[in-house]
């Protein structure tokens, strides 16, 4: 086992919430069996750890939310990988296992006396980010009636409550964006469309939903293809030639694709001289990512994409951008991250990394090239959901009592799940957070359009929205050319 | 939690092997969350439990195999369901968890003394039967370096050692039968073929392999369709009409299907008057099952199917058929099974079931309507594989020593895995058991043909074999008509 994964961020409290964030990148193929993770991550990792710590501080200082009860946490690193996340989840449930070992008399003291435990059980888990990892974690957590609230796992499979009863999410299922894509196709009377999807759960289930819904609307999916994100040039060329063979009839290409699949298509368009021949309609794997279009803007022009609605959270930046390694000691990964971010050595610090020659100077600040994690609002909403669920449960089980009454010791996961499913509150961006019977949240998307804004200057602009079934589009903006 | 699942079959020994068998049917949809299993099973359940117990007796009394070491077991019920199997697997690994709790000082005695454990750790696990369940179990076991040997989980996904390092099987991957099906298509120069597969892992991955291999061989898969086994009449009719529309060119239909999907197709053929128009080539989901063709024999005539080679094991029947509830007390499910099998009440027994009115009489015998589990040979080979792996490990770690030397206390799962992967021995049916680099066993299949043997008498007959890449077919037998 790799020692870095043993690191845990703890914050004490009357009730402990677990969290799984991808503090490090996933293990490379040769390191998978050791479960040795990759480099530290800022957006998907450190920022989320800090969001958890700071959000709990905010909740604990809010007199209207869980009065007389402090929330603590145990944050673990999933490394965006099933095996690592599962191993860490076992740490979460260790306590439940040991308590039942004692019940069954499998742990005994040498002198026959009873043993005691030194760790509070986890009542719920926030995360992890990836759907396939979340599925594995849920398989384990549900055995112990531990609710799980995800902030970015959007796979349709997770809506199946017979399989994933204790799973909820503050993001919609991908079925919603499939619907949004169909609604766009309908709006512009595109009756003959080619389709591409990325191999794997995200692309396959998303495209299946898109095709089913299209069929019901009388839209002909002329031809459908799939490709791996990491496929070679030849595979992408072959695919483009197939799409080309259906021109000019099937000019629209619906792509339920990861970002790197879209990039592969754009690169093949360049090689085959096909810029401008297709109109790409992309799912949120593309969204408004510059790493998808960088260097291939001309091929991407006109693309219409779906993006999950999540404005930046200002108060998080106010907190985060002030953090420094000499004072932020509660985040056990922070020094490692600081050195990685600024490629320098924190001399004299516990986690000093000698691989960096340059010493970190005191003028460094996180404001430099700062980009807030695009899912920040969802992460915070997931934490607040857990707090509101516990609050409602306390109100119902301990009427007229401030704090944890006996009826909440220990916390019953089944009751907490019921309470969470009924939760609704105003989220961090002012939108209503609530859960349907499948534990899913409403679909709210922005519709983006990739345009040439001026000579050799390209950008994504917001041309519409899709909110829980209602599509609004600025048609003039979609079809206008900027660079006249 | 349902109490029946807490039942465990134990057999003491120096080394304990875990096993997961589907002693009960899977929970019905309304019982899934309680993980309350269905009725007791004979072939897939009780027979496999008895096979484990009796095979270990045979191994323990064999002076040449693990001399001075007794093998014991802990058999648990998977109920053919992921959540149940995962819960049971946690019981297997509890011990590892507790030992590390102690290392980390999380379990302490009131007086500060050390705790001790009263249960031997499991060194490996046999089973479970289903691929999707085996995947879940493997995800957990590999975290603790516990090798798993499966006897009927054939999904191609399980060959991926980056994902499933500690997984091995005495059955081939479905990629092999896909290859066998392609070889049959090639042999008869069928260049234009329609394809059908059952929705789900088995059908999808199998058909994908079949299509990839066909393409390489220049075989045109004209049209490819998928359907759920439990789809309605209309869905099957619709599919048959699509297949019909490609007649007479695409008369061969390759079906990588579960048995009930094939049955659905046969029933639709009856409704649409299409008996005899197609030649079905079926995977081992059909094999030689009468429950697939029953009542629809005329539609199935000519079908060529793949069946895993596994002759009955005579010595198992010699043992099993003598078992009686008053003497077979080591199998904790046996009384429940006996009452279910004979629909009677075992009066005065511990597990007497009052739902049966009739009392079981002493003349009852398992010989009545006995059918040996079709996978029996594989179950036994899996157990022997574990024994030979441990034997070879002992020979290498404890040279010149009979019994467990210190180098094997505790048993290191990584070393055991290495030893298992190198294992080869003569299996229960006289064939060589060995594992390739993916932990898979060679593909050995029988080719069956469903024929009209006389007026209104139909049966499967063996018309060939496919052994590790070599197809042998009795062409005259395939194309002859019996009922002249």
């Amino acid at each position: 086992q790799s020692s870095e994964r043993r690191v845990v961020a703890h914050m004490p409290g009357d009730i402990i919430i677990g969290a799984l964030f991808s503090v490090h990148h996933q293990p490379t193929v040769d390191k998978v069996h050791e479960r040795k993770c990759g480099a530290v991550r800022e957006q998907y990792g450190i920022q989320r750890v800090e969001a958890m710590l700071h959000t709990l501080e905010r909740i604990n200082s809010d007199p209207t939310l869980l009065p007389n009860i402090t929330l603590g946490c145990e944050i673990r690193d999933s490394c965006w990988h099933s095996a690592v996340a599962l191993e860490q989840s076992i740490e979460f449930i260790r306590d439940s296992l040991i308590s039942s070992e004692e019940e069954e008399g499998l742990v005994r003291c040498v002198d026959g006396s009873s043993s005691f435990r030194s760790k509070k059980p986890i009542v719920g888990v926030i995360g992890p980010g990836s759907s396939s990892v979340a599925i594995q974690v849920q398989n384990l957590l549900q055995l112990f009636n531990i609710p799980q609230i995800a902030y970015s796992a959007t796979s349709m499979d997770l809506s199946d409550k017979t399989l994933f009863k204790y799973f909820m999410r503050v993001v919609p299922s991908d079925a919603q964006q499939a619907r949004a894509m169909v609604d766009i196709v309908k709006r512009y009377n595109w009756t003959y469309v080619s389709a591409v999807h990325t191999e794997g759960n995200y692309g396959e289930s998303g495209m299946e939903a898109f095709k089913d819904m299209s069929a019901k609307e009388g839209i002909c999916i002329a031809h459908s293809y799939k490709i791996y994100s990491n496929a070679g040039e030849q595979s992408f060329d072959k695919l483009l030639k197939k799409l080309r063979s259906h021109l000019p009839k099937a000019r629209v290409v619906a792509c339920f694709c990861e970002g790197m699949t879209v990039r592969g298509l754009l690169m093949a368009m360049r090689r085959l001289g096909l810029a401008g021949e297709f109109l790409l309609l992309g799912s949120d794997g593309w969204a408004d990512r510059y790493d998808v279009t960088d260097g291939y803007q001309r091929e991407a022009v006109g693309g219409i994409t779906i993006k999950l609605q999540s404005p930046d959270v200002k108060w998080f930046d106010d907190y985060y951008l002030k953090l420094r390694p000499e004072t932020n000691l509660r985040n056990p990964w922070f020094q490692e991250f600081w050195q990685h971010r600024f490629q320098c050595r924190l001399e004299g610090f516990a986690q000093e990394n000698s691989k960096y020659n340059k010493t970190c100077n005191s003028s460094l600040t996180l404001r430099t090239h700062h980009v807030q994690d695009s899912k920040m609002g969802f992460v915070i909403n997931a934490i607040y959901s857990m707090a509101y669920g516990l609050h409602n449960m306390q109100m119902s089980l301990c009427p007229g009592y401030a704090g944890l009454c006996d009826a909440m010791k220990p916390i019953d996961g089944r009751k907490l799940l019921d309470s969470l499913m009924k939760t609704n509150f105003t989220g961090v961006s002012g939108d209503m957070i609530l859960f349907d019977e499948n534990g899913d949240s409403p679909g709210r998307y922005e519709i983006m359009n990739f345009k040439e804004m001026g000579k050799d200057y390209f950008d994504y602009i917001n041309v519409g929205s899709w909110d829980n079934g209602e599509l609004k589009m600025d048609d003039d903006e979609v079809w206008s050319k900027k660079n006249n | 939690q349902s109490s029946e699942r807490r039942v465990v079959a134990h057999m003491p020994g120096d080394i304990i092997i875990g096993a997961l068998f589907s002693v009960h049917h899977q929970p019905t949809v309304d019982k899934v969350h309680e993980r309350k299993c269905g009725a007791v099973r004979e072939q897939y359940g009780i027979q496999r439990v008895e096979a484990m117990l009796h095979t270990l007796e045979r191994i323990n009394s064999d002076p040449t195999l693990l001399p001075n070491i007794t093998l014991g077991c802990e058999i648990r019920d998977s109920c053919w369901h992921s959540a149940v199997a995962l819960e049971q697997s946690i019981e297997f690994i509890r011990d590892s968890l507790i030992s590390s709790e102690e290392e980390e000082g999380l379990v302490r005695c009131v007086d500060g003394s050390s705790s001790f454990r009263s249960k031997k750790p499991i060194v490996g696990v046999i089973g479970p039967g289903s691929s999707s369940v085996a995947i879940q179990v493997q995800n957990l076991l590999q975290l603790f370096n516990i090798p798993q040997i499966a006897y009927s989980a054939t999904s191609m996904d399980l060959s991926d050692k980056t994902l499933f390092k500690y997984f091995m099987r005495v059955v081939p991957s479905d990629a092999q039968q896909a290859r066998a099906m392609v070889d049959i298509v090639k042999r008869y120069n069928w260049t234009y073929v329609s394809a059908v597969h059952t929705e789900g892992n088995y059908g999808e991955s199998g058909m994908e392999a079949f299509k990839d291999m066909s393409a390489k061989e220049g075989i045109c898969i004209a049209h490819s369709y998928k359907i759920y086994s439990n789809a309605g009449e209309q869905s099957f009719d619709k599919l048959l009409k699509k297949l019909r529309s490609h007649l007479p060119k695409a008369r061969v239909v390759a079906c990588f299907c579960e048995g009930m999907t094939v049955r659905g197709l046969l029933m639709a053929m009856r409704r649409l008057g299409l008996a005899g128009e197609f030649l079905l080539l079926g995977s081992d989901g059909w094999a030689d099952r009468y429950d697939v063709t029953d009542g629809y024999q005329r539609e199935a005539v000519g079908g060529i199917t793949i069946k895993l080679q596994s002759p009955d094991v005579k010595w198992f029947d010699d043992y099993y058929l003598k078992l009686r509830p008053e003497t077979n007390l080591r199998n904790p499910w046996f009384q429940e099974f006996w009452q279910h099998r004979f629909q009677c009440r075992l009066e005065g027994f511990a597990q007497e079931n009052s739902k049966y009115n009739k009392t079981c009489n002493s003349s009852l015998t398992l010989r009545t309507h006995h059918v040996q589990d079709s996978k029996m040979g594989f179950v036994i080979n899996a157990i022997y594989s574990m024994a030979y792996g441990l034997h070879n490990m002992q020979m290498s770690l404890c040279p010149g020593y009979a019994g467990l030397c210190d180098a094997m206390k505790p048993i290191d799962g990584r070393k055991l895995l290495d030893s298992l992967m190198k294992t080869n021995f003569t299996g229960v049916s006289g064939d060589m058991i060995l594992f390739d680099e993916n932990g898979d066993s060679p593909g050995r299949y029988e080719i069956m043909n469903f024929k009209e043997m006389g007026k209104d008498y139909f049966d499967y007959i063996n018309v060939g074999s496919w052994d590790n890449g070599e197809l042998k077919m009795d062409d005259d037998e395939v194309w002859s008509k019996k009922n002249n």
Partner: antibody, heavy 121, light 106 residues
Framework: QEQLVESGGGLVQPEGSLTLTCTAS?????????MCWVRQAPGKGLEWIAC???????TWYANWAKGRFTISKTSSTTVTLQMTSLTAADTAAYRC??????????????WGQGTLVTVSS | ALVMTQTPSSVSAAVGGTVTINCQAS??????LAWYQQKPGQRPKLLIY???DLASGVSSRVKGSGSGTEFTLTISDLECADAATYYC????????FGGGTEVVVK
């Protein structure tokens, strides 16, 4: 041009037998469409009798026709209907028809003009 | 066995009018139903298949509808040439014709 022509009809004694022939021209049996027989008693409705697959030679019959009527393919362009134990109730115009799609249970796309069978003493 | 019941046995309507013929199946046949027109001394002519699809060369005045066990043939803007007997045929788990409906155009 696709055409079906029936022959072999006429007067037959009760309990007698008769074989009708349907000859196809301009039709390729290898296209797989099924050939069937349908009858129509004078002033009455249509009644399906039987169908045959040109590929497998499998046959399908109406329940009432089983045992007395036999459909068979005698060449790549002819189909016959053998009728035994005839009674007055079998008096009808017998038409040959080709299915619209492959399969015994289908609409009939092409019809012959019919041949009259009269069962009388 | 599949049985088809057709109603009415006879119907008359004026030129330019509309007639509706019903057909009931003894079991669920989904959309596996055809309609034919037959004039005296002529062979039957396929009008509709799969309950609502128009056979080639058939006037769009002819419309089929229904599924399961209840089906309808509607002929609008009646012409003299529409005078004939109309038959339904169920083709699912067997072939069976309805008894026929004579349409008289006045």
């Amino acid at each position: 041009q696709e055409q079906l022509v029936e022959s072999g009809g006429g007067l037959v004694q009760p309990e007698g037998s008769l074989t009708l022939t349907c000859t196809a021209s301009g039709i390729d049996f290898s296209s797989g469409y099924f050939m069937c027989w349908v009858r129509q008693a004078p002033g009455k409705g249509l009644e399906w009798i039987a169908c045959i697959s040109p590929y497998s030679d499998n046959t399908w019959y109406a329940n009432w026709a089983k045992g007395r009527f036999t459909i068979s393919k005698t060449s790549s362009t002819t189909v016959t209907l053998q009728m035994t134990s005839l009674t007055a109730a079998d008096t009808a115009a017998y038409r040959c028809a080709r299915t619209m799609a492959i399969g015994a249970y289908n609409p009939f796309k092409l019809w012959g003009q019919g041949t009259l069978v009269t069962v009388s003493s | 066995a599949l049985v088809m019941t057709q109603t009415p046995s006879s119907v008359s309507a004026a030129v330019g009018g509309t007639v509706t013929i019903n057909c009931q199946a003894s079991q669920n046949i989904y959309s596996n139903l055809a309609w034919y027109q037959q004039k005296p001394g002529q062979r039957p002519k396929l009008l509709i298949y799969d309950a609502s699809d128009l056979a080639s060369g058939v006037s769009s005045r002819v419309k089929g509808s229904g599924s399961g066990t209840e089906f309808t043939l509607t002929i609008s803007d009646l012409e003299c040439a529409d005078a004939a007997t109309y038959y339904c045929q169920g083709y699912y788990s067997g072939n069976a014709f309805g008894g026929g409906t004579e349409v008289v155009v006045k």
